[in-house]
């Protein structure tokens, strides 16, 4: 089996308030099966931003068509960015189970929010 890697190519992304932020994430293997989730922050206080298994997440859309059976691109776009959205975002693969368990995390992408241009 090819070992699954999670690639978040951007260490940081800067977006003006009110715009959309694209956070990139690709995986290198479909296995083990289980959902992809995005979180802001780490540890017990982290905030769920997107879960492939459930929805909807009104401000979040996937960049690619995740219903394709071979899809490995789980990049997301977050609309109408505000300063409260600033933080480090992690793309995380979960392995199926009862409950699903965290399998591997991307390195994270830091989102910074610039003031809305006047």
């Amino acid at each position: 089996e090819e070992e699954l890697q999670i690639i978040q190519p951007d260490k940081s992304v800067s977006v003006a308030a009110g715009e959309s932020a694209i956070l990139h994430c690709t995986i290198t293997s479909l296995f083990p099966v289980g959902p992809i989730q995005w979180f802001r922050g780490a540890g017990p206080a982290r905030v769920l931003i997107y879960n492939q298994r459930q929805g909807p997440f009104p401000r979040v859309t996937t960049v690619s068509e995740t219903t394709k059976r071979e899809n490995m691109d789980f990049s997301i776009s977050i609309s109408n960015i505000t300063p409260a959205d600033a933080g480090t975002y992690y793309c995380i693969k979960f392995r199926k189970g009862s409950p699903d368990t965290e399998f591997k995390s991307g390195a994270g992408t830091e989102l910074s929010v610039r003031a809305k241009p006047s």
Partner: antibody, heavy 118, light 107 residues
């Protein structure tokens, strides 16, 4: 409520073609992958084909590849199955089904009967 | 191919377990589908190994481990008489496969 209603079933002769339709309502059709499943008389369920939410990617069981074509029209909330070169073995009730995020099924139509007979 | 028993029987109130084997836990998700008569619309009772749709009674539960999945009906009722099909989605082949079905008889 989610509703899937198949139509287009008929009695046809071997070698002829038929197009089945599935009208979807009660959910955002363009967000879901869809599948066709059939059941021959006295037999079990058999998955035939699936299609991604946007319609760009299709998947087939080997026995119908090249003869059957799955397609969709998201503007009409409709799923289709074009069946060519029909044989007696294609006699079955044909169901459309909505896929879950991981390509199983959550909602089913009532089915439409296709009879291939000379 | 997914393998399940051809038939099981139980008295009302008993617990029934139907197994489905032949998938690979690493790459397969399982679902269970109830069909009360041939040609009638199947009803999803479990998908994603253990997820029960909101309109399905809580006596239905699912689990998966190793190369097998199990549908459990705790406190079976007469109205649960049906054929139960397991299905698997294999992420290696992108193909869905059904078992041959298990006829549940409630005595």
């Amino acid at each position: 409520d989610v509703q899937l209603v198949e139509s287009g079933g008929a009695v046809v002769r071997p070698g002829e073609s038929l197009r089945l339709s599935c009208a979807a309502s009660g959910f955002t059709f363009s967000s879901y992958a869809m599948s066709w499943v059939r059941q021959a008389p006295g037999k079990g369920l058999e998955w035939l084909a699936g299609i991604s939410a946007g319609g760009s990617d299709t998947y087939y069981i080997d026995s119908v590849k090249g003869r059957f074509t799955i397609s969709r029209d998201n503007s009409e909330n409709s799923l289709y199955l074009q069946m060519n070169s029909l044989t007696a073995e294609d006699t079955a009730v044909y169901y459309c089904a909505r896929e879950t995020w991981n390509h199983l099924f959550d909602y089913w139509g009532l089915g439409t009967l296709v009879t291939v007979s000379s | 191919a997914l393998t399940q028993p051809a038939s099981v029987s139980a008295n009302p109130g008993e617990t029934v377990k139907i197994t489905c084997s032949g998938g690979d836990w690493y790459s397969t998700y399982y679902g269970w589908y109830q069909q009360k008569s041939p040609g009638s619309a199947p009803v999803t009772v479990i998908h994603s190994d253990d997820k029960r749709p909101s309109d399905i009674p809580s006596r239905f539960s699912g689990s998966a481990s190793g190369s097998a999945a199990t549908l459990t009906i705790t406190g079976v009722r007469v109205e649960d008489e049906a054929v139960y099909y397991c299905a698997g989605y294999d992420g290696r082949t992108y193909i869905n496969t059904f078992g041959a079905g298990t006829t549940l008889t409630v005595l």
